[in-house]
Amino acid sequence: ALDTNYCFRNLEENCCVRPLYIDFRQDLGWKWVHEPKGYYANFCSGPCPYLRSADTTHSTVLGLYNTLNPEASASPCCVPQDLEPLTILYYVGRTPKVEQLSNMVVKSCKCS
Amino acid sequence: ALDTNYCFRNLEENCCVRPLYIDFRQDLGWKWVHEPKGYYANFCSGPCPYLRSADTTHSTVLGLYNTLNPEASASPCCVPQDLEPLTILYYVGRTPKVEQLSNMVVKSCKCS
């Protein structure tokens, strides 16, 4: 699987999850998030050669098409597969609120 | 929605579904498919600016991050959202077989 365990160890050039630390205030301008100050959101990148973690029949077909017609530039793209939530603390007035934001952390990627 | 109806009419530069006709024999080397000879598989391409048909909270965050940090090159990617099956006819010996291949035709795209 193209997950953090594999990708962060092997530094694959093809489609894989990459580490990306986001500071809420500095990188997004979100001053309202009190904790955490930032988190590893990660992201997916890298080429999707034929059959690499193909998501659907279409991505398999498109990968083959691109292999046989490389000038066509129509190839699958490396995108998130498994995502995890992130719990944040913020304030409404002086009242602390804890909320779980869904799909905030990329754990693995696929070619779609 | 970034679907064929909208995208094929408007020729959007940002993330949209693009027409792609695939001839099974010529483009894939699949001589075993008897009918159809080819089909519109389509594909997704185009930039994913902040908030364009964002798939998850992560793609929204990544889109904002990329807007504020354009040199970072970590941005969402335009990939299939809705796919449809394709019915094909092939032969096993002299016996005709009809099969529905799932997820063969891209009908719409999203930024993931």
Partner: nanobody, 119 residues
Framework: QLQLVESGGGLVQPGGSLTLSCAAS????????MSWVRQAPGKGLEWVSV????????HYSDSVKGRFAISRDNAKNTLYLQMNSLKPEDTAVYYC????????????RGQGTQVTVSS
């Protein structure tokens, strides 16, 4: 089976005009964008123009903008390219292509039509 048949090419003097046609069959023509591409002698395929499925949206390469006009007749399953103020550098084999050739350079399906601009 998808088929595209181009016609209307010929020999024309610089500054002259031609109208190319492309008859399409084997698919629902009215649903898809269509393009014109060309191949000059010894060169690769060059995108010329694209038109949206309903004919409302059109784009042109910088080299032909203001001189060429793309159009379509969905009732007749036909694509057109009106070429005005022709230049010697427009000499090429012209192909129509299913889809938007700005994004995908697939193989040419038709036989093309030769346009030669010369005095």
């Amino acid at each position: 089976q998808l088929q595209l048949v181009e016609s209307g090419g010929g020999l024309v003097q610089p500054g002259g005009s031609l109208t190319l046609s492309c008859a399409a069959s084997g698919f629902t023509f009215s649903l898809y964008p269509m393009s014109w591409v060309r191949q000059a002698p010894g060169k690769g395929l060059e995108w010329v123009s694209v038109i949206g499925s309903d004919g409302g949206t059109k784009h042109y390469s910088d080299s032909v903008k203001g001189r060429f006009a793309i159009s379509r007749d969905n009732a007749k399953n036909t694509l057109y390219l009106q070429m005005n103020s022709l230049k010697p550098e427009d000499t090429a084999v012209y192909y129509c292509a299913e889809g938007d050739s700005r994004y995908v350079r697939g193989r040419t399906r038709g036989q093309g039509t030769q346009v030669t601009v010369s005095s």
